[in-house]
Amino acid sequence: SERCDDWGLDTMRQIQVFEDEPARIKCPLFEHFLKFNYSTAHSAGLTLIWYWTRQDRDLEEPINFRLPENRISKEKDVLWFRPTLLNDTGNYTCMLRNTTYCSKVAFPLEVVQKDSCFNSPMKLPVHKLYIEYGIQRITCPNVDGYFPSSVKPTITWYMGCYKIQNFNNVIPEGMNLSFLIAFISNNGNYTCVVTYPENGRTFHLTRTLTVKVVGSPKNAVPPVIHSPNDHVVYEKEPGEELLIPCTVYFSFLMDSRNEVWWTIDGKKPDDIPIDVTINESISHSRTEDETRTQILSIKKVTSEDLKRSYVCHARSAKGEVAKAATVKQKVPAPRYTVELACGFGAT
């Protein structure tokens, strides 16, 4: 057969669907790989062909579109399962071609089972809610296109295993779940079950997402350097190890990059000809505020090193701060016989 542009297996699109539920899967060619959409391709005389490789098999085979009740069908650039079965798991390929053009991509589809409490191997999207921030909503995800707007589905929301009713701060409102005020105790998995009729049959769509309550922008502050500070002096003798911790608190900020770094005499440690190691540890609060500690270490400090300027810097979307450590050379205690005796005129 003639050459075909093969985009390979698109593992970025690790599609997971629940067993015994409808699934609609768009051919990824038009979403990620080609610069034109399905309508343009179709009007140019290109045909979209689907086939698949079963799990643990190498053989590519056509998809059977003649199953009872049209269990698997294709509509434009969408492959439909009404509903899925466990053995639909495999790698699916969509190929766009005519006599002179060919392009194809494969993607993995995994049909997963869930238990009565909606637990499953499904990777869950995470929705972040700001703590004590006023009304915030989550929306039942990925249900568009399953039924026409004329159909009015029923939606039931669950937290974990439990139907949400009479919760004091969480209210189901159709496709939305409203949090009147979010607390840490609202962390957890929330599931919407959408039930709709189609051609005399009833289908269910189950969508679970993880809610994580995070620090509110109302409480966000620029980075706070707790150490070094004015109360601690790093006094060392040459040959001793110098350890200076830089401990910085960062408020949670959506999509902010938190940075901590040291400068020695105004330069990055890598640019200074001394043997410096820097170890970093990070801890998070219950609302994803972050505390970063970078420990600057010089194994055997010299008197030159003890004269240098050591500054800890921190930056987030809220601002940049810096703090110098107070480093001194320890003055040796006087030895009586020599130094003090000299003071009394001894020679």
Partner: antibody, heavy 119, light 108 residues
């Protein structure tokens, strides 16, 4: 009005375990967190850990992690704290406290359960 | 772990006087999640203030909280006889949740 009712005082031998219960009455139980705090005689308060009954999410302080088990029975609105390998330093009043109703602070406390560890 | 240091350890005052209790954190308190509790002898602690400055239900307005970051204060504007007790601060924003060592407010 929500109340937290704890089980009665216990006397235990070193090396044994104790299981303290905390029953909620007069309100929704499972959607709030229940935490456990202890207080040794004449000492301050020490957080041990907590659970959100509805999701089963449990976490505990590092120094108790290998000895503490926190569970909840939603059908009876009861939370439990079991502490194993008891030693004399575990002699304390153990409190359960609810949070997550109007804030994440401990707004309602049980009356406390005295646990004495003595040979 | 965030260490909370309360001062003074003991405060000797007369009824009607103003009490100022301090709580200092070793690191910034996340989401302003700092609370104050009152504990009378033989009783369970009682929530006074949460979120640094918000009074809990039923707490008289002579109790007020303030501060941010690492320094927090509980103020009792006019001490009543029933206010003589031990007061604890607590941060509940970072795990492990931690309490201060307590300040005893006693009658002078």
């Amino acid at each position: 009005q929500v109340q937290l009712l704890q089980s009665g005082a216990e006397v235990k031998k070193p090396g044994s375990s104790v299981k303290v219960s905390c029953r909620a009455s007069g309100g929704t139980f499972s959607i709030y967190a229940i935490d456990w705090v202890r207080q040794a005689p004449g000492q301050g308060l020490e957080w041990m850990g907590g659970i959100i009954p509805i999701s089963g999410t449990e976490n505990s302080a590092q120094n108790f992690q290998d000895r503490i088990t926190i569970t909840a029975d939603k059908s009876t609105n009861t939370a439990y704290m079991e502490l194993s390998s008891l030693r004399s330093e575990d002699t304390a009043v153990y409190y359960c406290a609810r949070n997550g109703a109007t804030s994440d602070a401990f707004d309602i406390w049980g009356q406390g359960t005295m646990v004495t560890v003595s040979s | 772990e965030i260490v909370l240091t309360q001062s003074p350890g003991t405060l000797s005052l007369s009824p009607g006087e103003r009490a100022t209790l301090s709580c200092r954190a070793s690191l910034s308190v996340s989401s302003n999640y700092l609370a104050w509790f009152q504990q009378r002898p033989g009783q369970a602690p009682r929530l006074l203030i949460y979120g640094v400055s918000r009074r809990a239900t039923g707490i008289p307005d002579r109790f007020s909280g303030s501060g941010s970051g690492t320094d927090f204060t509980l103020t009792i504007s006019r001490l009543e006889p029933e206010d003589f007790a031990v007061y604890y601060c607590q941060q509940y924003g970072s795990s492990p949740l931690t309490f201060g060592g307590g300040t005893k407010v006693e009658i002078k």
